[in-house]
Structure formats: structure tokens, C-alpha cells
Interface confidence: low
């Protein structure tokens, strides 16, 4: 069998055996090397030779195998915007960026451009957890049979009501979605308004 | 069809300048890098420079023999590449060709004939 | 800058001869050769790239062969319309180089 062309090679059906790899060149109808992620193309191919990759300037980068003349300048993350930095800048990955805590993403355009506060949980609810952090606001679900949760927060969570006679307490007053169990030692007497149905 | 005109040749004397102009149509010459190659009367084909695409910087290379007293530019908006020739001196008569540089040239125009002489 | 020889410098040679140049370069350069013809009072015309590939509307009779410095250009069958002469050009580095031509004459 024939040898593979290795590029530059004709191609008359404008097509490359390598999409990932190779890009149609189409003034001289000829299959050309991309240059891999980190580099970028300092001369174009021709019918005799093929293109020539240049690595990435500090401080830029290209992603994919590529046939840019340019690398892609790196931009820090915006703290006006919220997000933050989880990972710096490479030759071959763009800086990644996510919103701070305590915001989510208002504004994506393949990747989150604007963060925002989360919404405030009322007491008795809590912000239903999601897949990724910082995705969307909060959609705040109420608090399960037993627990609590008595901040208007963003991010605090449901907690189980006390149980008193793990403290060797007896319950004063039932637990509610918005408050804990009130608990009491057992010798106290019982407050005032209660005494009376004790009289014989 | 792809077609390269060059124009502007003529006499001049020696310390003299000339501009020659290359038009080109048939092909995308934004896309092109150009250059200029050379024949003395008589005599084999010398390079004489060329220019990239402005996608490539736009950038020039000049042979020896000419640096320095020759200038290369090309205006994309109107397919047009130029040749600015300054301190002409005798051994610069020639005819002068423009052409499509691929690395091969590919596509030449008629030549234009520069002649230094007093 | 990287010389090129070309020989002959000229020859005499018959329709439906095999007609042979040859060029060689000072150093290596790959298979960054090309050939052209010209014809008096015309512009050079481009033959073969690459060493060896056949310009599109190029007769087949014109071959290329050879890589590194030693590069040659045959004529299978030499047509009337092929006296001319010849120059080998390489594009491996700046500034690109010609050969000094070979003429091929009607013997």
C-alpha cells in the first residue's frame, strides 16, 4: 500500500484526513498542519512547506490545535465582576475562573462573564444544593420534618432539631422549621401558666 | 484567470528613483505573500525581496545588493503591490517582475524594464 | 545565502532526445527546489515544485527528482516548444537563490 501523504497534500475534495489536526488551505488547494495547543502558526504553509508553529508569549495561549497567527491574550478574573482565579494562565489553557462564594453566575457566554450575590433563605428554608458551585441563585426549599434553620442567610443550612433527653433534658417547647427544640432540666418546676392544671 | 500587470519602468539616471507598481487580480492578495525577482540583460533571475500578508505581520526581506535603498509595500485595498527604488545605480537596470511567493512562484507578471543610465 | 550550480551551462540537444539538467546547493535543503523555464522576451514559467511535483498544465515528459543538494530535471522527450532555458530556485532560506540557467538549444 501507498505511503499516507504527510502534509502539505492536494486535495481536491477540499476535505483533510485530520480535522483535528490539518485545515484545508484553499488559494492552493492543499491540506496543511494545525499547530498544537500552545502554539500558534509564525509562517503559513505552502505547496512545498508546511506550516510553522512558534510557541506561545508569556502571558498568551491557544487552546486547540489551531492555524491562528496569534495567540490569545490571558486575562486575569474580575473581582468587579466576582469571580476569582482556580487555576492560572498556561501557554495552553486560558486562566480559569469561578464566581466567589456567596455569588453565582448572572452572565455566560461559554464561560461566566458576571457574578452576582445569591438570594438570601428566609428562616425555615435552605438553598437547594446543586451540581456546581456558583451555577445558579438560590431556590430555597424548606426545611425538612426535624430541622431548622432561623437566619435569613445565603448559605446556611437546615440543622436537626436538639433532642433534649440526649442532653438528659426534658423538651420545654417543641421544635419548628424556623426554631430549635427549647429544652429543660428536669427538676425545674413548670413556668406559671402551667402550674394551675397541676392543683388537686 | 490570474493576472499580474507591472507598470512604472522607464530611464533614470544613476543616484535617481522609481516606483513600480504590480496589479493584481485573479486570486485573494490578501492572502498572498509577493515578491520582486530581477533579469539583467542578458543575464540568470535574482531576488530582489518581497513582502508578507499583513496577517503574517507584513513584514519585509530584502536581498543584499538592494537593502537599504529599496522599499516594498503593498495596499491590499487595491491589489496593488509596489516597488520604491531609491539611489539607483547601473547595475540596477533589469527587468523587474512581480510574483506570487508560495515558495514557488507561481504566477509572474510581464516584467517592467528599468534602465539606469546617464 | 546558499549557492546553487547548475550544469550544464548549456546544451545542444534534438527533438525526441532525453534532456538532463542538474542542480546541487551548498548545504542541504530538504526538497525546497523548483524549476522553471524561460523563453526570450517571456517571464519564467513554474515547472515543478517541491523537488519532484508537476505544476497543474505542465507536461508529464518534465520529471523532478532529488532531495538534500543534489536535485535534477529531465525532459523524457524533447518537444520543439521545449527550447528554452532552465533555472533551479530554492526556497529553503532567505534569500532564496536561482541557479545561473542552462540553455537548451536545437542541435
Known amino acids: 500500500s501507498q505511503p499516507q501523504a504527510v502534509p502539505p497534500y492536494a486535495s481536491e475534495n477540499q476535505t483533510c484526513r485530520d480535522q483535528e489536526k490539518e485545515y484545508y488551505e484553499p488559494q492552493h488547494r492543499i491540506c496543511c498542519s494545525r499547530c498544537p495547543p500552545g502554539t500558534y502558526v509564525s509562517a503559513k504553509c505552502s505547496r512545498i512547506r508546511d506550516t510553522v508553529c512558534a510557541t506561545c508569549a508569556e502571558n498568551s495561549y491557544n487552546e486547540h490545535w489551531n492555524y491562528l497567527t496569534i495567540c490569545q491574550l490571558c486575562r486575569p478574573c474580575d473581582p468587579v465582576m466576582g469571580l476569582e482565579e482556580i487555576a492560572p494562565c498556561t501557554s495552553k489553557r486560558k486562566t480559569q475562573c469561578r464566581c466567589q462564594p456567596g455569588m453565582f453566575c448572572a452572565a455566560w457566554a461559554l464561560e461566566c462573564t458576571h457574578c452576582e450575590l445569591l438570594s438570601d433563605c428566609p428562616p425555615g428554608t435552605e438553598a437547594e444544593l446543586k451540581d456546581e458551585v456558583g451555577k445558579g441563585n438560590n431556590h430555597c426549599v424548606p426545611c425538612k420534618a426535624g430541622h431548622f434553620q432561623n437566619t435569613s442567610s445565603p448559605s446556611a443550612r437546615c440543622q436537626p432539631h436538639t433532642r433534649c433527653e440526649n442532653q438528659g433534658l426534658v423538651e420545654a417547647a417543641p421544635g419548628t422549621a424556623q426554631s430549635d427544640t427549647t429544652c429543660k432540666n428536669p427538676l425545674e418546676p413548670l413556668p406559671p401558666e402551667m402550674s394551675g392544671t397541676m392543683l388537686m | 484567470e490570474v493576472q499580474l500587470v507591472e507598470s512604472g519602468g522607464g530611464l533614470v539616471k544613476p543616484g535617481g528613483s522609481l516606483r513600480l507598481s504590480c496589479a493584481a487580480s485573479?486570486?485573494?492578495?490578501?492572502?498572498?505573500?509577493m515578491s520582486w525577482v530581477r533579469q539583467a540583460p542578458g543575464k540568470g533571475l535574482e531576488w530582489v525581496g518581497r513582502i508578507k500578508t499583513k496577517t503574517d505581520g507584513g513584514t519585509t526581506d530584502y536581498a543584499a545588493p538592494v537593502k537599504g535603498r529599496i522599499t516594498i509595500s503593498r495596499d491590499d485595498s487595491k491589489n496593488t503591490l509596489y516597488l520604491q527604488m531609491n539611489s539607483l545605480k547601473t547595475e540596477d537596470t533589469a527587468v523587474y517582475y512581480c510574483t506570487t511567493d508560495y515558495g514557488d512562484y507561481e504566477y509572474w507578471g510581464q516584467g517592467t524594464l528599468v534602465t539606469v543610465s546617464s | 545565502d546558499i549557492q546553487m550550480t547548475q550544469s550544464p551551462s548549456s546544451l545542444s540537444a534534438s527533438v525526441g532526445d532525453r534532456v538532463t539538467i542538474t542542480c546541487r546547493t551548498s548545504?542541504?535543503?530538504?526538497?525546497?527546489l523548483n524549476w522553471y523555464q524561460q523563453k526570450p522576451g517571456k517571464a519564467p514559467k513554474l515547472l515543478i515544485y517541491g523537488a519532484s511535483s508537476l505544476q497543474s498544465g505542465v507536461p508529464s515528459r518534465f520529471s523532478g527528482s532529488g532531495s538534500g543538494t543534489d536535485f535534477t530535471l529531465t525532459i523524457s522527450s524533447l518537444q520543439p516548444e521545449d527550447f528554452a532555458t532552465y533555472y533551479c530556485h530554492q526556497s529553503y532560506s532567505t534569500p532564496p537563490t536561482f541557479g545561473q540557467g542552462t540553455k537548451v538549444e536545437i542541435k
Open positions: 548545504q542541504s535543503i530538504s526538497r525546497y
Open positions: 485573479g486570486f485573494t492578495f490578501n492572502d498572498a505573500w
